[in-house]
Amino acid sequence: WPPPGTGDIIVQAPTQVPGFLGDSVTLPCYLQVPGMEETHVSQLTWSRHGESGSMAVFHQTQGPNYSEPKRLEFVAARLGTELRDASLRMFGLRVEDEGNYTCLFVTFPQGSRSVDIWLRVLAKPQNTAEVQKVQLTGKPVPVARCVSTGGRPPAHITWHSDLGGMPNTSQAPGFLSGTVTVTSLWILVPSSQVDGKSVTCKVEHESFEKPQLLTVNLTVYYPPEVSISGYDNNWYLSQNEATLTCDARSNPEPTGYNWSTTMGPLPPFAVAQGAQLLIRPVDKPINTTFICNVTNALGARQAELTVQVKEGPPSEPSGMSSN
């Protein structure tokens, strides 16, 4: 119907526009008219797929009209101006606003021209990660919890860990209608080696410029793991005093150290000083098994070490002169 040889006019708009729940968003829509082309626009119309009637119209003489006047506004169209910009602002975005919209220009002599725009309603989730404090259960349990609250669409949660384990992720409706809360648990068999180590929860969402990383330091409660150090099998008579140390790893921290021997109480030459046992010089050989008993809130564990103090001076200082 336009005259032969007429270059066509084009409606320009993005195929998809994101907007945030509760915020306002502009649906951009422009009429691009090639250099030598002439066109006259008399009406701008916005309608939504699947709904009867138009939601916004800008008429050359009647001006703007809206199905929801408080929520819609033509950004640039004004009476008495060339109607080339049909951009529409929507206020107070709701979940139900998501959908396909048609922006249409009624022009002469080219006729009607339109374009479809998908409005995506997003909600930016709030993310938290927390440790799930556990004891040695011998079976897989959640040791960390990552929650992405109120996202639309649902956030995507993944875990990064060198400790093994596996995720267990679930979804539930968010506080605001149409939003989703995603909860992900990191599950493994707790061990003392895991305590104090970290795992990272990675949350990805359309609304984020980059993924959010949340690190969780794990807590595993376990009774003491005990060993005794400080003896090198080369202790001799008439040398300086030496020290044995009771090395204990536990969570929570040890509450007490108790030194004894397999024969009962400590001999006179052995003096307990908390986690350390001071061995004073002796004048005759000994062969004693020392016991360190360590207690924490979860229980007590012990370690044994047999110490021999031998005759004959060493060729070079060692053993009891080791401190």
Partner: antibody, heavy 116, light 107 residues
Framework: EVQLVQSGSELKKPGASVKVSCKTS????????MHWVRQPHGKGLEWIGG????????SYNQRFKGRVTITVDKSTSTAYMELSSLRSEDTAVYYC?????????WGQGTLVTVSS | DIQMTQSPSAMSASVGDRVTITCKAS??????VAWYQQKPGQPPKALIY???YRYSGVPDRFSGSGSGTDFTLTISSLQAEDLAEYFC?????????FGQGTKLEIK
């Protein structure tokens, strides 16, 4: 006040041409497209075509197969519609109408009678 | 061409009645539909544009609705001065086409 005043009735013989005028006032002539619509007696409305006074761009109903020419005189804010090779079925009231997508103002109409 | 089929072609109603006139397009015209009122011996007068928006000065008893292919003009409470013929028109694509009209008489 927007006004569209058309020329008077015409009686034409088959094969002749007719040129109807539409003088406008009360608005900026070059800002609105002007169209022509006809209505045979007791019948419906039929769109003939239109013109944008500023650019001279036109669009015609193909049914009229090159028999119609729409022009404007910007200096007098007047639009014209010329229909040639008239036949009896062209007998109708011819209206000029200002276009805003729909037609918001109409002339009073010009009766064109084609009869031998 | 897009055909606009109006119904009924004629009807009579009493003052105060609710009157509904329908118009069906032969293909999707979006909301690019106008309604006109034409009283005897006069040119048509625009009532509704873009399917559902009333022209300023048009009484609010006139309302339009619809999109796609099915459109309705409703007069909520008929008045004596509404005696006229009513036409729908699509302006989605060339050639612009009108319905054949609905003649409304007052009982």
């Amino acid at each position: 006040e927007v006004q569209l005043v058309q020329s008077g009735s015409e009686l034409k013989k088959p094969g002749a041409s007719v040129k109807v005028s539409c003088k406008t006032s009360g608005y900026t002539f070059t800002e609105y497209t002007m169209h022509w619509v006809r209505q045979p007696h007791g019948k419906g409305l039929e769109w003939i075509g239109g013109i944008h006074p500023n650019s001279g761009g036109t669009s015609y109903n193909q049914r009229f197969k090159g028999r119609v020419t729409i022009t404007v005189d910007k200096s007098t804010s007047t639009a014209y519609m010329e229909l040639s090779s008239l036949r009896s079925e062209d007998t109708a009231v011819y209206y000029c109408a200002r276009w805003t997508g729909d037609f918001d103002y109409w002339g009073q109409g010009t009766l064109v009678t084609v009869s031998s | 061409d897009i055909q606009m089929t109006q119904s009924p072609s004629a009807m009579s109603a009493s003052v105060g009645d609710r009157v509904t006139i329908t118009c069906k397009a032969s293909q999707n015209v979006g909301t690019n539909v106008a309604w006109y009122q034409q009283k005897p011996g006069q040119p048509p007068k625009a009532l509704i544009y873009s399917a559902s928006y009333r022209y300023s000065g048009v009484p609010d008893r006139f309302s339009g609705s619809g999109s796609g292919t099915d459109f309705t003009l409703t007069i909520s409470s008929l008045q004596a001065e509404d005696l006229a013929e009513y036409f729908c028109q699509q302006y989605q694509s060339y050639p612009y086409t009108f319905g054949q009209g609905t003649k409304l008489e007052i009982k």
